[in-house]
Structures are given as C-alpha cells and as structure tokens.
C-alpha cells in the first residue's frame, strides 16, 4: 500500500534483485519538484547502492539522489517535464538496472486535507468539503478525488464516490440513523498528468442523527 505502481520499461539482467518504483511530486515545495524511489523488495541490501537520474533535465546532464533510510530522494527545480529521463541503480560507476520514465506519468499528488462534514437539518443531508494544495499549483491542477466512507463497525465495507470538485453532498436517507461514520479522501491526476493515488487524507468521524419519526423512516442503504 505504498502508493507505487510499476511504470516504464525495466532493463538489465539483474532486474529481479534491484527492481524499483518511483513517484514524482511537482511543486511540492514552492517551485521545487521531488522524485522518490524505493526498491520493490524492502529486504534489498542497499549499503552501496545509489540512484542517478539523467536526461530531460535543465542545465545539468545527471543528478544524484539522496539516501534517506530505505528511500532515495531528489528535490530540485531542474526537471524539464518534457520527455523521458533515465533512472539507474548504481554501484560506483556500474549501472545495475535502469528505467526510462517520463516524470509527468508518475505523479503522486499531495494528500487532501481539512476534510469536514456538516449536517444540514433542513435539507436532511451532509455536506462534505475538503481542501487540496493543488488548487494553487501551476502544473498538476486537475485532479479526480475519491471520497470513501463507511459505517465504523463495517471494517471493509467502504462506499466510494469519485468527483472532480472538493464538495460532495450525502443524503441522510442513504446513511444509517444514529450511526458513527468514518470518511476520508484521496486524489489522482486527471488531465495531462498521469500517476498514482495520493495518500489518504486524515479520516473525519461523524455521527448521523436519530430517526425523526415525524418525517418517517429513513431509506435503507
């Protein structure tokens, strides 16, 4: 559940030992972009292994990654964001395996935040709102959001709603009365950029009101 997916062509004979995945985050720190890579196998001995990216860079030919425990990380303004880069696992000067990747196809958005649910008594509904830092970004502005909610006692019975806005209305009659619900949201690029789901937002918990007998029974889900 790392948010990774395989992307690009893997090359080299020692593929099985050193296969890796990467995701990019654009304008993650002001105008800086980041690229994070990690080995698929968490038990790989990474002691002498380094990552390097070459091609589709501004002003430089190649950049080296910083090693942060088991992940490899670059934060830079130098991604061209046009064409493919070559990302290689290296020992010294020797490349063990490489992938050609267009960084615009492995974008992982930042998680949404400020998720809240407000009950409207007159309308008999719940207004779900959340925020995303991508509204302020120049590149990855258009996202598809996945709102997931469940009754807290139903561990794996999530209901998902996909939407492009940051506001959703849930009808009270579609929810169980006097029940505790958990809701969360994640995002994925949905226009020119491609990639992976963000991490989930922090969950928000809310309780539905009791049935109001004067207005009749609530519909079952």
């Amino acid at each position: 559940e790392s948010g990774y997916a395989q992307n690009g062509d893997l090359e080299d004979a020692e593929l099985d030992d050193y296969s890796f995945s990467c995701y990019s985050q654009l304008e993650v720190n002001g105008s800086q972009h980041s690229l994070t890579c990690a080995f698929e196998d968490p038990d790989v001995n990474i002691t002498n292994l380094e990552f390097e990216i070459c091609g589709a860079l501004v002003e430089v030919k190649c950049l080296n990654f910083r090693k942060l425990q088991e992940i490899y990380f670059i934060e830079t303004k130098k991604f061209l964001l046009i064409g493919k880069s070559n990302i290689c696992v290296k020992v010294g000067e020797k490349s063990l395996t490489c992938k050609k990747i267009d960084l615009t196809t492995i974008v992982k958005p930042e998680a949404p935040f400020d998720l809240s649910v407000v009950y409207r008594e007159g309308a008999n509904d719940f207004v779900v709102t959340f925020n995303t830092s991508h509204l302020q970004k120049k590149y990855v502005k258009v996202l598809m959001h996945d709102v997931a909610y469940r009754q807290e006692k139903d561990e794996n019975k999530w209901t998902h709603v996909n939407l492009s806005s940051t506001k959703l209305t849930l009808l009270q009659r579609k929810l169980q009365p006097a029940a505790m619900y958990e809701i969360k949201v994640r995002s994925i690029p949905d226009h020119y950029f491609k990639g992976f789901w963000s991490e989930w937002s922090p969950s928000y918990y809310f309780r539905t009101p009791e049935i109001n007998n004067s207005s009749g029974e609530m519909d079952p889900i």
Epitope: A38, I71, W200
Partner: nanobody, 113 residues
C-alpha cells in the same frame, strides 16, 4: 504485521507539557504520512496532526502553535510534543499510518488542576 505502540501519556496540570511517542513496525515507515488522532470520553475520534513522508506538517486549529509533530525515519518513530496543555486536550491519543483498520492501544493524556 502492522504494529503501532503509543507511549508518553500521563497526568499534567494546565499549561504543562508532555511528549508522546509512537513506534511503528510492519510498514515502510519512511514512505508513509503519519498522523495523531485523539478521542475524549464520549466523543468522536478526531484528527490532531500529520507529518507527511516529506516532512510537511499540519495541525487542527485548536492545537496550532502548541503541539509539534516530528518523525525519525531511522527509528520508525513519530512524536507529538504538546505544550501549553489545556483541560480540553484530555483524551486517549493514537498514532496512525493512514490505514484506519490498524490502531494501537493509545496513550491517555489527562489535563487536570
């Protein structure tokens, strides 16, 4: 298997400080956003703070400027430094790695005069 173990809670007077710690195992810690939640008696669980894999932090409004979340990827731990504690901060505090199917036992924080 995922394990989250919280510690550091206790009884403290208003205005006092505590530092909560959470040790995580069974996850690729440095790749995960980490969160603190809390649940007061008879109340819904609520989000308190987040630190992303990249180190960006976020806080609920009522704790901004008083609480600080931090992480140590080498030790797979996430801490919550709580200063200026108020009576309404009394709750059981839980850390979480984004999958709410997994919770630790929590650590009780009681602010009382």
């Amino acid at each position: 298997q995922v394990q989250l173990v919280e510690s550091g809670g206790g009884l403290v007077r208003p205005g006092g400080s505590l530092r909560l710690a959470c040790a995580a195992s069974g996850i690729r810690f440095s790749l995960r956003n980490m969160h603190w939640y809390r649940q007061a008696s008879g109340r819904q669980r609520e989000w308190v703070a987040t630190i992303t894999a990249g180190g960006v932090t976020g806080y609920r409004d009522s704790v901004k400027g008083r609480f600080t979340i931090s992480r140590d990827n080498a030790k797979n731990t996430v801490d919550l430094q709580m200063n200026g504690l108020q009576l309404e901060d009394t709750a059981v505090y839980y850390c979480n790695h984004g999958d709410t199917a997994y919770w630790g036992q929590g650590t009780q924080v009681t602010v009382s005069s």
